[in-house]
Interface confidence: low
């Protein structure tokens, strides 16, 4: 029995005086607890308490189920125990069957034994199959057995407690352990759609997905900036042991412009949080936004094609659109496609294939379009250049020589004097009056120059040549002269060529 | 129609603080970027600062960074100008200007307040 | 920060055109806008990026630009075009903030 100083309260005194007591089932159990300040007896196994206020526990008729822990305790709280085991042949364990362990952690087989004396005391799997190779085990027989460190994978495993009597293997009820998953990441979060764009007055609803190992994840939505507590519904599912889904769905039956804004999805678990954001962006009007993928001024050589291109943003959906060209419509050479398949796409590609464009070709090329609100357009200024083309050369009444020339950009005309039949002319004359004429043709079409040098100041045969050019290329065009006597006799033009 | 009205500007002396508000309405607020200009008595425009569609982002003229926040309630269709250590050089007009296009920050002001007196005077 | 430089004063004839010119480094890259302000008023746009007019703005307003000079030319000046005209662009230096010009008085004779 403890010594105690006197003075300092000590703890009660039981008899018998040992830790561990061995009875057999059916005889007496009689404990006393000795102390001036006795209070109560208590005995604990399992789950179950029983208290006793007497300072004498009696139990005439011992059974098995009287195997546990008694205590004594004194009005200072300090308390002294016994342990009883109540060997009982046919019934060597006593068993609480509920068995949760959480992965990572130490669960308790409780399986108590009522003799302590017995062999062996084990684990063993249900209908012989072996036990988990890392499964480790620490048997206590006043508590049961200690499984360390559950794994995830030990999850509905079914076992016994096993021990040796006799030579014999006797084993407990089943256990069926189930695991409860440690949460080793975040929780998995997403978003029906990442972005929501609604008029006034339609129905906003989105939907957040949440995935972890089990239901005890924690998820709401937010709107960011705002402690408003938002209207959500749930819908859960168990896709097997450690795949848990939640879908939350918030609604927002007739969204205003002021709702406008960031919601988020937030969830967390003990290892941490995840969030996903959708924005939702409500305009009190549709609107429809063009932006030009080339610039809206554009030069094109005689004869090539050219794409004009437009990107847009439409909402709601287009529902019309259309190239004009000198107020005609194009029924084909143009395709008008969403730029991705996404659902919540608001923006458009439209392209107008222009092919082989000729110099008449030029002008304004629009391109509209509409929705149930709003109407937009895009006008495209297309410049064909040409290479200049020798319209007229002729000997005028007056002694001019005159050449007409048409091409886009705005051709340049030079003038040269070769001597006798040679077409290589290199000897430059002046013009004597230079006109830029007005084309009858469209806005864009070619320009048209007039050029005119005075013959009189050619006293030998030979030919003059007028070469028109700009950026795109060159032309030229040939006069021949003869002189008979002191007469020019004639002055006639070449066929027109490019040397 | 699109409005933009500041709230009274008002007198301030050196070093103290003043918040200037603008109303909108009349197109979706929260679409929009906002700017403040400022016009000092008898002289020429200067850009202040500029607040995104969102109110994430925000850029300042040199002349008030570190002493002038801009901030929006996209919720109430408000922008406001908060001005500390307020300087005599900051007397001026202050006019509200919504950016043309939707979602741009930097871009041409198409509607602008009607403009508020701010006087720092001691 | 780069400056948008503008004539302090310009004066037409009524009826007369008229260019008021804006000179900056960073309209080697962008557009100018312009801003119409009559006394006491806040400031108008009158013309945004290659040559736009906001809906209102008559069609005597028009713009242009060549090299680092933007132009706005009042075709036909009227009475009531009597006001200051501000150019606005973008900072060149790569902060994108706006940036206006002097101002540039117009009296319409």
């Known amino acids: 029995q403890p010594s105690v100083s006197p003075g300092e309260p000590s703890p009660p005194s039981i008899h018998p005086g040992k830790s561990d007591l061995i009875v057999r089932v059916g005889d007496e159990i009689r404990l006393l607890c000795t102390d001036p300040g006795f209070v109560k007896w208590t005995f604990e196994i399992l789950d179950e308490t029983n208290e006793n206020k007497q300072n004498e526990w009696i139990t005439e008729k011992a059974e098995a189920t009287n195997t546990g822990k008694y205590t004594c305790t004194n009005k200072h709280g300090l308390s002294n125990s016994i342990y009883v085991f109540v060997r009982d042949p046919a019934k060597l364990f006593l068993v609480d069957r509920s068995l949760y362990g959480k992965e990572d952690n130490d669960t308790l087989v409780r399986c108590p034994l009522t003799d302590p004396e017995v062999t062996n005391y084990s684990l063993k799997g249900c209908q012989g199959k072996p036990l988990p190779k890392d499964l480790r085990f620490i048997p206590d027989p006043k508590a049961g057995i200690m499984i360390k460190s559950v794994k995830r994978a030990y999850h509905r495993l079914c076992l016994h407690c096993s021990v040796d009597q006799e030579g014999k293997s006797v084993l407990s009820e089943k256990f069926i352990l189930k695991v409860r998953p440690a949460f080793k990441a975040v929780p998995v979060v997403s978003v029906s759609k990442a972005s929501y764009l609604l008029r006034e007055g339609e129905e906003f609803t989105v939907t957040c997905t949440i995935k972890d190992v089990s239901s005890s994840v924690y998820s709401t939505w937010k709107r960011e900036n705002s402690q408003t507590k938002l209207q959500e519904k749930y819908n859960s599912w168990h896709h097997g042991d450690f795949n848990y889904e939640r879908q939350a769905t918030l609604t927002i039956s007739s969204a205003r412009v002021n709702d406008s804004g960031v919601f988020m999805c937030y969830a967390n678990n003990t290892f941490g949080s995840a969030n996903v954001t959708t924005t939702l962006e409500v305009v009190d009007k549709g609107f429809i936004n063009i932006f030009p993928m080339i610039n809206t001024t554009v030069f094109v050589n005689d004869g090539e094609n050219v794409d004009l291109i437009v990107e847009y943003e439409a909402f709601p959906k287009p529902e019309h659109q259309q190239w004009i060209y000198m107020n005609r419509t194009f029924t084909d050479k143009w395709e008008d496609y969403p730029k991705s398949e996404n659902e919540s796409n608001i923006r458009y590609v439209s392209e107008l294939h222009l092919t082989r464009l000729k110099g008449t070709e030029g002008g304004t090329y629009t391109f509209l379009v509409s929705n149930s609100d709003v109407n937009a357009a895009i006008a495209f200024n297309v410049y064909v250049n040409t290479k200049p083309e020798i319209l007229t050369y002729d000997r005028l009444v007056n002694g001019m020589l005159q050449c007409v020339a048409a091409g886009f950009p705005e051709p340049t005309i030079d003038w040269y004097f070769c001597p006798g039949t040679e077409q290589r002319c290199s000897a430059s004359v002046l013009p004597v009056d230079v006109q830029t004429l007005n084309s009858s043709g469209p806005p864009f079409g070619k320009l048209v120059v007039q050029s005119s040098i005075d013959s009189s100041a050619f006293k030998h045969n030979g030919t003059v040549e007028c070469k028109a050019y700009n950026d795109v290329g060159k032309t030229s065009a040939y006069f021949n002269f003869a002189f008979k006597g002191n007469n020019k006799e004639q002055i006639h033009p070449h066929t027109l060529f490019t040397p | 129609q699109v409005q933009l009205v500041e709230s009274w500007g008002g007198v301030a002396q050196p070093g103290r603080s003043l918040r200037l508000s603008c109303a909108a309405s009349g197109f979706t607020f929260s679409s929009f970027a906002m700017h403040w200009v400022r016009q000092a008595p008898g002289k020429g425009l200067e850009w202040v600062a500029v607040?995104?569609?969102?109110?994430?982002?925000?850029y300042y003229a040199d002349s008030v960074k570190g002493r002038f926040t801009i901030s929006r309630d996209n919720s109430k269709n408000t922008l406001y100008l908060q001005m500390n250590s307020l300087r005599a050089e900051d007397t001026a007009v202050y006019y509200c200007?919504?950016?043309?296009?939707?979602?741009?920050?930097?871009?041409?002001?198409?509607?602008w307040g009607q403009g508020t007196l701010v006087t720092v005077s001691s | 920060s780069s400056e948008l430089t503008q004539d302090p004063a310009v004066s037409v004839a009524l009826g007369q055109t008229v260019r008021i010119t804006c000179q900056g480094d960073?309209?080697?890259?962008?557009?100018a806008s312009w801003y119409q302000q009559k006394p006491e008023q806040a400031p108008v746009l009158v013309i945004y990026g290659e040559n736009s007019r906001p809906s209102g703005i008559p069609d005597r307003f028009s713009g242009s630009s060549s090299g680092n000079t933007a132009s706005l030319t009042i075709t036909g000046a009227q009475a009531e075009d009597e006001a200051d005209y501000y150019c606005n662009s973008r900072d060149s230096s790569g902060t994108h903030l706006r940036v206006f010009g002097g101002g540039t008085k117009l009296t319409v004779l």
């Open positions: 200007a919504k950016a043309m296009v939707r979602g741009v920050t930097f871009g041409d002001l198409d509607y």
């Open positions: 960073s309209l080697r890259s962008y557009y």
């Open positions: 607040t995104s569609y969102d109110g994430s982002n925000e």
